[in-house]
C-alpha cells in the first residue's frame, strides 16, 4: 500500500524548489525498479516528483490565499513489466499559511450620524475589518481594533469594532469628526499587519439652545396717523441650534397699554412689531415694551434649556403729525 | 465713568443767542437719547428738549418751539443747545442729562450752565 | 400733558425720622413711568427711583418708591444728615413732566 504523512507547503517561498514530501509504496524494495508519477492539476508545473524516490517538490512560489490546497493523484509503476504497482490514489497538498494580508475594511466609506449630547457609552457604528489570512491558523487573521483619531470623544471596543461616544459633544462647537481605527492582526502582537479607516461621524441637532435676542433694546417709531395693523418695526433673536429646533415664537411679554402686538416671521424668524390701537402723540408720545421669544418646537426632555425665555425691550417713540 | 460737562453759559440781551455744549465721556454717546433740562432760580425742573440716539428725532417743550434747536455731534462726543429769541424766563442753568437706556428717566446729569437774559 | 403736585411742600424732620413724600398725577402715569430725584444745594439732581419702585444705581436701601396710576409715594426711611435736601417727582408716560419739588429741611 502506499504509504505518506499529510504534505504541507508553505506559501510565499522564494526557493526554486521547496521539498513538499515523498510518495512511497511499501512495496519499493529502493533497487529503483518503480517509477513514480504525478497528476491532476498543478502536477508538472506546481510540483514535481523525482521519479525514482517519489520526492515531491513546489517549484513554484504559492499564495494560500489564491489556492490553498491541490488535489493530486499518485501512480507506481513497476518498470521492469510496465505494470501499476498500486492502485492510482488521491492525496492532498495544503498550503500552509503565513501572516502575509494585513486587514482591510470593505465597507469604506463609513459614516454615522448620532444625536448631540448623547451620553457616554451611546453606539454610534461598527466597523469590521476582514483578512485574508486563515483564520484557523494561528492569529494571522485575528484582529484588534484600535482608535488612532477621536479620542476624548469616542472609543473602539477591541474585539468587535463598535464604536461609542466617550464624552459628550456639542453641535454647535463642532459638527462633525474624523475618527480613524485601525485594525491589526496577530492580535496585536510583534510581527502584526494593520489597514486603517476613517470614519465621518456627523452630529445631529437636538434642541438644546433657546432663542436669545441679538440686542436688549430695540428702537422704533410709529406715526400717530398709523392705522391699525401697521408694521412698526422688526425684532430679531438667534438660536445656536438648526432646522425645526431654530423655529421661535416672538411674543408680547409687558405692555400695559396694550397698544401693540408681535407676529412671528416663519420665513425670516423675525418678530414684527405692529400697532393694536392707534396712537396719539399729544396723550402719550413713547411707549416700553418687553417682548419675549421662544422655540416653536421644545421637546419634554430637554425643557431644562428653556426655562428663563431671552426678553427685550422696545422703546416706540410717536411721532407728532400736525393737525389740521 | 460718566461724565457730562456743559459749557457755553453767559449773559446775552434779550432777543440774542446763545449755543450751549455737553461734552460726554465715560460711555457710548451714540447709543443714547440726550436731553436738556433748566432750573430757573429758586425755582424746580423744566424739561426743554429731547433728542434720539441717532440724532433723527428731536422733541421740544413748548415754552421753546421754534426758538430752541437741539443737536448732537457724534464724532465729537458732545450735545448742543441753540437758543435764539432769547427772553427773559429763559434765564436758568441749563443741565444735560442722558436718558437710561432700558426707560426714560435721567441717569446721569452734568453740572450745569448758568444763562442770563437781561438787558 | 401731566401735571405732578407733590406735597408738602417743605418737610421738617430730624435725623432718624421717616420722610414720606407725595406727588399726585393730573391723570394716570401708564406703566409706572415715574421717578424721583434728589438734588442738594448747588448740585445737579441725582436720580434716585425709576419705574416707581426701582432703586438707581448706587441708591442707599432707605430710599423706596410707590405707588401706581395718579399717587405715588417717595418714603425715606431714617434721614441721614446727607438726605436733607430737595426731591423731585418726574413723569415720563408723556414727554417729561416734573413736580414743583418738595424740600426735606432739618427740623
Known amino acids: 500500500g502506499w504509504v505518506w504523512n499529510q504534505f504541507f507547503v508553505p506559501e510565499e517561498m522564494n526557493t526554486t524548489s521547496h521539498h513538499v514530501g515523498r510518495l512511497r509504496s511499501d512495496l519499493d524494495n529502493g533497487n529503483n525498479s518503480f517509477q513514480y508519477k504525478l497528476l491532476g492539476a498543478g502536477a508538472g508545473s506546481t510540483f514535481i516528483i523525482d521519479e525514482r524516490t517519489g520526492d515531491i517538490y513546489a517549484i513554484e512560489k504559492l499564495d494560500r490565499e489564491e489556492r490553498s490546497l491541490y488535489i493530486l493523484r499518485a501512480q507506481v509503476i513497476d518498470i521492469t513489466t510496465g505494470r501499476a504497482v498500486e492502485p492510482e490514489s488521491e492525496f492532498v497538498i495544503k498550503v500552509s499559511d503565513i501572516n502575509d494580508n494585513e486587514p482591510k475594511f470593505l465597507d469604506e466609506p463609513y459614516e454615522a450620524i448620532v444625536p448631540e449630547m448623547s451620553p457616554e457609552g451611546t453606539l454610534v457604528i461598527q466597523v469590521t475589518a476582514s483578512d485574508a489570512d486563515d483564520p484557523s491558523s494561528g492569529n494571522n487573521a485575528r484582529l484588534l481594533y484600535s482608535l488612532l483619531q477621536g479620542q476624548p470623544y469616542f472609543s473602539v471596543e477591541p474585539t468587535t469594532g463598535v464604536i461609542r461616544i466617550s464624552s459628550k459633544m456639542d453641535r454647535e462647537l463642532q459638527d462633525e469628526y474624523w475618527v480613524i481605527i485601525q485594525a491589526k492582526d496577530m492580535i496585536g502582537q510583534p510581527g502584526a499587519l494593520s489597514g486603517t479607516t476613517s470614519v465621518l461621524i456627523k452630529l445631529s441637532d437636538v434642541n438644546d439652545n433657546k432663542p436669545i435676542f441679538k440686542e436688549s433694546l430695540y428702537r422704533l417709531t410709529v406715526s400717530e396717523s398709523a392705522p391699525t395693523g401697521t408694521s412698526i418695526g422688526t425684532i430679531m433673536a438667534y438660536d445656536n441650534d438648526i432646522g425645526e429646533n431654530a423655529e421661535m415664537d416672538y411674543s408680547i411679554e409687558e405692555d400695559d397699554s396694550q397698544t401693540f402686538d408681535i407676529i412671528t416671521n416663519h420665513e425670516t424668524q423675525e418678530g414684527i412689531v405692529i400697532l393694536k390701537k392707534k396712537v396719539n402723540f399729544e396723550h402719550q408720545n413713547h411707549y416700553g415694551i418687553r417682548a419675549k421669544v421662544k422655540n416653536h418646537h421644545v421637546d419634554e426632555q430637554l425643557m431644562k434649556y428653556h426655562t428663563e425665555a431671552s426678553t427685550t425691550f422696545i422703546k416706540i417713540q410717536v411721532e407728532d403729525v400736525d393737525e389740521p | 465713568q460718566v461724565q457730562l460737562v456743559e459749557s457755553g453759559g453767559g449773559v446775552v440781551q434779550p432777543g440774542g443767542s446763545l449755543r450751549l455744549s455737553c461734552a460726554a465721556s465715560g460711555f457710548t454717546f451714540s447709543s443714547y437719547d440726550m436731553h436738556w433740562v433748566r432750573q430757573a432760580p429758586g425755582k424746580g425742573l423744566e424739561w426743554v428738549a429731547v433728542i434720539s440716539y441717532d440724532g433723527t428725532n428731536e422733541y421740544y417743550a413748548d415754552s421753546v418751539k421754534g426758538r430752541f434747536t437741539i443737536s448732537r455731534d457724534t464724532s465729537k462726543n458732545t450735545l448742543y443747545l441753540q437758543m435764539n429769541s432769547l427772553r427773559a424766563e429763559d434765564t436758568a442753568v441749563y443741565y444735560c442729562?442722558?436718558?437710561?437706556?432700558?426707560?426714560?428717566?435721567?441717569?446721569?446729569w452734568g453740572q450745569g450752565t448758568l444763562v442770563s437774559v437781561s438787558s | 400733558e401731566i401735571v405732578l403736585t407733590q406735597s408738602p411742600g417743605t418737610l421738617s424732620l430730624s435725623p432718624g425720622e421717616r420722610a414720606t413724600l407725595s406727588c399726585r398725577a393730573s391723570?394716570?402715569?401708564?406703566?409706572?413711568?415715574l421717578a424721583w430725584y434728589q438734588q442738594r444745594p448747588g448740585q445737579a439732581p441725582r436720580l434716585l427711583i425709576y419705574g416707581a419702585s426701582s432703586r438707581a444705581t448706587g441708591i442707599p436701601d432707605r430710599f423706596s418708591g410707590s405707588g401706581s396710576g395718579t399717587d405715588f409715594t417717595l418714603t425715606i426711611s431714617s434721614l441721614e444728615p446727607e438726605d436733607f435736601a430737595v426731591y423731585y417727582c418726574?413723569?415720563?408716560?408723556?414727554?417729561?413732566?416734573f413736580g414743583q419739588g418738595t424740600k426735606v429741611e432739618i427740623k
Open positions: 391723570q394716570s402715569v401708564s406703566n409706572t413711568y
Open positions: 442729562a442722558r436718558e437710561r437706556y432700558f426707560d426714560w428717566s435721567f441717569d446721569y
Open positions: 418726574q413723569q415720563y408716560s408723556n414727554s417729561w413732566t
